[in-house]
Interface confidence: low
Amino acid sequence: CRTSECCFQDPPYPDADSGSASGPRDLRCYRISSDRYECSWQYEGPTAGVSHFLRCCLSSGRCCYFAAGSATRLQFSDQAGVSVLYTVTLWVESWARNQTEKSPEVTLQLYNSVKYEPPLGDIKVSKLAGQLRMEWETPDNQVGAEVQFRHRTPSSPWKLGDCGPQDDDTESCLCPLEMNVAQEFQLRRRQLGSQGSSWSKWSSPVCVPPENPPQPQVRFSVEQLGQDGRRRLTLKEQPTQLELPEGCQGLAPGTEVTYRLQLHMLSCPCKAKATRTLHLGKMPYLSGAAYNVAVISSNQFGPGLNQTWHIPADTHTEPVALNISVGTNGTTMYWPARAQSMTYCIEWQPVGQDGGLATCSLTAPQDPDPAGMATYSWSRESGAMGQEKCYYITIFASAHPEKLTLWSTVLSTYHFGGNASAAGTPHHVSVKNHSLDSVSVDWAPSLLSTCPGVLKEYVVRCRDEDSKQVSEHPVQPTETQVTLSGLRAGVAYTVQVRADTAWLRGVWSQPQRFSIEVQVSD
C-alpha cells in the first residue's frame, strides 16, 4: 500500500483490544481545504515505541488503515480511498508493548465536517435572572454550532452542561451560578447539524466569582489619640481570600473580590462631607470623632453584604486647653491654633443627651492671632450653649475640610452654658452646731459639678455681724461641707457659699444667719 492511501488490507498487528485505561482518545477529523482532510487524536500513556493506525470503515463494510507511526495527526486527500461524501466510521488503533489499544469511534461525513474553534475572544459574563449568561462573538465562518460547557468548583470535579444549538453572529449560554463558591468554566463548539462532527478544543478558562461576594470577616482596632489629634485605624484580621478552582489559580480575572472601607464621620455634622470610601489596604488616620466603619465586599456582580462597626468618640478631655470669656456682647472661645489657614469645627451637645443632638459650627479658614490662638465667638441671641446646663465641646481642625480623613481633634472639654455664675450658685446651705466654737456648713452640690473640670472650687464666706469681719474658706470641688471654727458664742454670723470656675467667679448664695448659743452652767 502507498503511504498516501488508505490500505484495504489487514493491519500489521493482531486484532485484540487490550482494554487498558491508556491509549488513544479524542479523535477529531475534519476537512481543512477543498480536497484535504486531517485527523488528530491524543494518546494517554507512555509514548515510547507506540505506533498509531487510523482505521476507517466505509458504509459498504470495507475497512482500511493509514499508518501514522508515532505521530498523533494525519492528513490525507479525497483521493486516498476514503469516501468523503458518505458516512464513514473512523477510530485509532495504537500498537504498543505487544498489545492493541483502541479509541472510541466517530461516525461522520468528512466533506461536511469543518474544524470548529472554541470561543476565542472575550467571553462576556453577566448575571441574568439568577443564572450566569456568557456571550461571545461567533468565530469567523462558523455560524451554526452546538455548544457545551463544563464547570467545576474548588471542591467538585468537572460537570458537563449543554448550551444548546446556536445560529447567530453572537453565541450565548446560560449556566448555573453558584451562590457562595467560585467556578471555572470552559466552552467548546461543534458544527451544528453535521452528524458525528468533532468537538473543538475547550476554550481558555472563564473564572466566575460566586453570586454573593464573601462577607468580610475583619476586625479593627483603633490606636490612642496622638499629640496631633489623630488615631490610626488598623486592621486586625485580613479578609479571607476566595478559594479558586484549579484553572483559576494565579491570575484569575473575573473572580476578584474587592474590599472597600466606607467611613462615616458622625461627629461635626455641619462639615461638607460625611462619608468617604477607601481601599481596604489603605488604613486611614482618624480624628477622635465617632465614626461608623463599613467594609463592603464586591465582585463583578456587584456589592455583597457589608460588615459595620461603630468607633466611639475619644472622650479624653483637656480641661485647660480652652479659654472662654463671657462678655455683655456674647461669648468667645480661645484655644491654641493648629496651623495657618485651618478650618475648625466646634461641636457641642448637652451632657447626658443622645449623641444625635449635637450642634456644630464651622469656622472660615483662619490664621492664629498674635498670641497663637484660634477663636470662635457667638452672641447671646444665637442661642448657642445658651441653656444653663453642661455641654460637652469638641473642636476639630482641618486644612482640607472636604477630605474626611484629614480632620484632627484639637481638644475636647466641658463647658457650662448660660449664666454659669448664677446657675452654679449652691443651694440648700445649712448650718449645724459642731462644738462650742465651731459649726458644720453643708450645701447641695452646684450644678457646675455635673460638668467635669468646670467647677474649680467652692468658697465659703463667714461674716461676723458684730465686728463686720469676713473670712473666706476655699473648699475642694468634690466637697460639699466645711467646718468653721474659732467662732464666739452669742455672736450673730452669716454664711454664704459660691461656686467658681477657672474663668468665672460665682454668685454668692443667700446669706444664712446663725449663732452659737451661750452655754449656761448649772
Epitope: L128, A129, C163, G164, P165, Q166, S172, C173, L174
Partner: nanobody, 118 residues
Framework: EVQLVESGGGLVQAGGSLRLSCAAS????????VAWSRQAPGSQRELVAS???????KYADSVKGRFTISRDNEKKMLYLQMDSLKPEDTAVYYC????????????WGQGTQVTVSS
C-alpha cells in the same frame, strides 16, 4: 419562576388560519431565543419555528411559507401565525424559550391544542 403560557389554539377547518400567542414571565425574554414546537399523538415532538434574540428565524420544511413566527420583546410575547392549515398540522403546540435555536431549549410551556379538520 419562569412561566410560558400558550393561548389561541382551537378547532379550525383545513385551509383556515390561527394565531397562537405565548406570554413569558420570569425570564429575561429579550436575551433568549424562543421557539414553537409541536407533538402529534404517537409522534415525537418536532421543532416548528424558532426566532433568535437578534430576530433571525428558522422554520421546519413542512411549514415554510405557511407559518410566521414573531416576537414582541417589550410585551414578552411570542406569536405563531398559521395560515393554509392542513390536517397534518393537528398537534399540541408548545412555546419554548432559552438560549438555543433548536428543540432543547431551557423552558417549555404547557401547550395549546390545535385541531385541523378536513
Amino acid at each position: 419562576e419562569v412561566q410560558l403560557v400558550e393561548s389561541g389554539g382551537g378547532l379550525v377547518q383545513a385551509g383556515g388560519s390561527l394565531r397562537l400567542s405565548c406570554a413569558a414571565s420570569g425570564i429575561a425574554f429579550r436575551y433568549n431565543s424562543v421557539a414553537w414546537s409541536r407533538q402529534a399523538p404517537g409522534s415525537q415532538r418536532e421543532l416548528v419555528a424558532s426566532i433568535s434574540n437578534s430576530a433571525r428565524t428558522k422554520y421546519a420544511d413542512s411549514v415554510k411559507g405557511r407559518f410566521t413566527i414573531s416576537r414582541d420583546n417589550e410585551k414578552k410575547m411570542l406569536y405563531l401565525q398559521m395560515d393554509s392549515l392542513k390536517p397534518e398540522d393537528t398537534a399540541v403546540y408548545y412555546c419554548g424559550a432559552g438560549r438555543s435555536m433548536a428543540g432543547d431549549v431551557a423552558y417549555w410551556g404547557q401547550g395549546t391544542q390545535v385541531t385541523v379538520s378536513s
